[in-house]
Amino acid sequence: VSRWHQQSQRSQWGGRGTTDRFPEIILERCVEYTQTLLPEMRHVDCQNIWDAFKGAFISKHPCKITEEDYQPLLKLGNQTVPCNKTLLWSRTKHLAHQYTEIQRDVFTLEDTLLGYLADDLTWCGEFETSEINYRSCPDWRKDCSSNPVSVFWKTVSRRFAESACGVVHVMLNGSCSNIFDKKSTFGSVEVHNLQPEKVHTLEAWVMHDGRGDSRDLCQDPSIKELELIISKRNITFSCKNIYRPDKFLQCAKTPEDSSCISKI
């Protein structure tokens, strides 16, 4: 605690500081999302969103943020993703986003309002001042896990998983030694917050790293572990090998081609 106190005084943390123009970026993204990307959310008041976002971390110790702090923001940014249209991902962020860029009716967390606002941003405040800290913010490993960014993603990831229904897809990286990583946000938060009364199937897409690789990565021990966790929660598990991520790139360039329209 004394170390935190000293660090908070001089505001020197192990991670990068708040993203430049953070308040402006949040407002700009909010307006773009609610007015252009998803006009059915045009009722959302972006100033209120920013106030709630700010209220979650400003004047609070950046190592003592709780999920409760983000509840007002979650309430304002509440959004319903249609059944069968939730795409989770783990270490495949770029591919997952290329997919939803084309398949516009499918949503990753970052395709929802709150995920879109915060994607790739860093933020934190300072204890007992109304300042945003642009110099440094707590690093999850070096400093503390209850920092504004980590708690935000844990909170919205939990909510995203809880609200999913029907068939849920997860895109996993077949190039990693642990295809399913229990320590990832997917493995530690989302998997455990899928609701069996709403979600009947979790289908994993294991992305191979190129053509010519004919292995069945759905047989990987970590996938078997995921299957066990999911099955114990009374959710049906299925897994598919996806051998052609190269096609993502082609379709990202020419999304209007009918070969880029796919039912999932």
């Epitope: 090998n241 996806i242 991520p245 796919s262």
Partner: antibody, heavy 121, light 105 residues
């Protein structure tokens, strides 16, 4: 509507060569990967070769690797299969097929009517 | 490469249900497509991505895939459904099953 028309088949002696063509129309040819699939008389379907939309990547079944070459001319909306060192077991109807299925799964939504290649002395 | 095995033939009475199996080691881990081929004609896609029907294919055609078996089901079989049927998957290369002749008794 999508049309694929193969040509260039015929009778050829073992060890000989043949060049098949597939003229495509009714879709943006340069946006699609294309493939050749063959069917020996009274037998099942066998994938032979594939080529990416811009021709930068080519793929072959082990049975034809080193003997067949797939290519395309997007300005002419035409797919080719150059077949060298032909063997009796290459005798088949050769179909040109458009690869569909976006990025999650791969299948052939459109096929030509096929051209017969007979390798015999 | 995955090997896909189909029964050589399936016989069914008109109006009855025909089920064509396509077995392979953990085939449920791969997407499967099905083609119909009538004598002297090119194959026609009837099911893709396990269970999706292209436009123009009658609703009586359906597909499923799990474990070691993918299945094409033709409900209320009609005379025009008499044909050869091939399953196909992809695991770095395209693989076809040997084909099943559906005969309407």
């Amino acid at each position: 509507q999508v049309q694929l028309v193969e040509s260039g088949g015929g009778l050829v002696q073992p060890g000989g060569s043949l060049r098949l063509s597939c003229a495509a129309s009714g879709f943006t040819f340069s946006s699609y990967a294309m493939n050749w699939v063959r069917q020996a008389p009274g037998k099942g379907l066998e994938w032979v070769s594939g080529i990416s939309s811009w021709g930068s990547s080519t793929y072959y079944a082990d049975s034809v690797k080193g003997r067949f070459t797939i290519s395309r001319d997007n300005s002419k909306n035409t797919l080719y299969l150059q077949m060298n060192s032909l063997r009796a077991e290459d005798t088949a109807v050769y179909y040109c097929a458009r690869e569909d299925g976006s990025y999650m799964t791969d299948y052939f939504a459109y096929w030509g009517q096929g051209t017969l290649v007979t390798v015999s002395s | 490469d995955i090997e896909l095995t189909q029964p050589p033939s399936v016989s069914v009475a008109p109006g009855q249900t025909a089920r064509i199996s396509c077995s392979g080691d953990n085939i449920g881990h791969y997407y499967v497509s099905w083609y119909q081929q009538k004598p002297g004609q090119a194959p026609v896609l009837v099911i893709y991505s396990d269970s999706n029907r292209p436009s123009g294919i009658p609703e009586r055609f359906s597909g499923s895939n799990s474990g070691n078996t993918a299945t094409l089901t033709i409900s209320g079989t009609q005379a025009e459904d008499e044909a050869d049927y091939y399953c196909q998957s992809y695991n770095g290369t395209y693989v076809f099953g040997g084909g099943t002749k559906v005969e309407i008794k």
